[in-house]
């Protein structure tokens, strides 16, 4: 199931790159699959929020992204995720790349990457 989510994540990243005009030399943070969930590409200064993944949920391929972005980009969905919600994880896109997730998955979602790799 996670191989399928990873493959769909890579497809979504590719579509997002096209929409946002990202390429390999673009400044910012590339989209990534971190073995738990999918992170969209982001510009430096953006905070990207994701909901804790449902472990056995298949990504909906019709949905371009399932995250909310705070920053200059308005690319996101209508979920209006907020760090004041439970079960929301954020990463900041910095000049040095992606920050660590906050909160850590284990604290925000109750599981970590070791479980989702099995």
């Amino acid at each position: 199931i996670f191989k399928k989510e990873q493959a769909m994540c890579l497809e979504k990243i590719q579509r997002a790159n096209e929409l946002m005009g990202f390429n390999d030399s673009s400044p910012g943070c590339p989209g990534m699959w971190d073995n738990i969930t999918c992170w969209k590409p982001a510009h430096v200064g953006e905070m990207v929020l994701v909901s804790c993944p449902e472990l056995f949920r298949i990504f909906n391929p019709d949905q371009v992204w399932e995250t909310e972005t705070i920053g200059e980009s308005d690319f996101g969905d209508s979920n209006s995720l907020d760090l004041s919600d439970m079960g929301v994880v954020s990463r900041n896109c910095t000049e040095d790349g992606w920050s660590e997730p906050f909160p850590h998955y284990f604290d925000a979602c109750g599981f970590d990457e070791y479980e989702s790799e099995t």
């Epitope: 760090l83 906050f102 604290d107 070791y114």
Partner: antibody, heavy 123, light 107 residues
């Protein structure tokens, strides 16, 4: 009914190792939904979470930075118990030590606790 | 580490009173907050998790509220067995940290 029973010495000399054990009944240390924690309480530091061990597809540990260089929490699956080892103790480590089970419902909380063990560090 | 503060540090009340204890976090913690009760010589006991959810077996006179940095524990119609010390605890970032406690004693 989950119960946690603590055992271990109440007096440890400075520079030595504090060792406590927490025996679990009504649950398993290998549970794939619980975490197994150690917390201590002293008048000077209040309640202080020290760390936890848990099993999912492998064993993992999380430790508080304040004790990370000195602490080890080990599960013992054959006896369904887990232990705390704190090395190089000083009188500041004198406290009541508790083991506790962590349960997840939107967040981690400690829903079952051991009876507590007063450990005094003194020569 | 996230610092947790509680007020008041102690309060005196009578059976039947309604009391409120406040807990404040040094940074936003959403609703990642638990409340515990501790009686002398005993281990802490979970009362409320995730700010307002009552733990199984806890009387409904206990209630919690709050989000972000400010939280409250309310006890309606204080009972003799409620005289104890109450602690809040954040569970958003390790190390999980506790407040210093609020001691509730008999007026």
């Amino acid at each position: 009914q989950v119960q946690l029973q603590q055992s271990g010495p109440g007096l440890v000399k400075p520079s030595q190792t504090l060792s406590l054990t927490c025996a679990i009944s009504g649950d398993s240390v290998s549970s794939n939904s619980a975490t197994w924690n150690w917390i201590r309480q002293s008048p000077s530091r209040g309640l202080e979470w020290l760390g936890r061990t848990y099993y999912r597809s492998k064993w993992s540990n999380h430790y508080a930075v304040s004790v990370k260089s000195r602490i080890t929490i080990n599960p013992d699956t054959s006896k369904s118990q887990f232990s705390l080892q704190l090395n190089s103790v000083t009188p500041e480590d004198t406290a009541v030590y508790y083991c506790a089970r962590g349960t997840w419902k939107q967040l981690w909380f400690l829903d079952h606790w051991g009876q507590g063990t007063l450990v005094t560090v003194s020569s | 580490d996230i610092q947790m503060t509680q007020s008041p540090s102690s309060l005196s009340a009578s059976v039947g009173d309604r009391i409120t204890i406040t807990c404040r976090a040094s940074q936003q913690i959403a609703r990642y907050l638990n409340w515990y009760q501790q009686k002398p010589g005993k281990a802490p006991k979970l009362l409320i998790y995730a700010s307002y959810n009552l733990q199984s077996g806890i009387p409904s006179r206990f209630s919690g509220s709050g989000s972000g940095t400010d939280f409250t524990l309310t006890i309606n119609s204080l009972q003799p067995e409620d005289f104890a010390t109450y602690f809040c605890q954040q569970a958003i970032i390790q190390p999980y940290t506790f407040g210093p406690g609020t001691k509730v004693d008999i007026k």
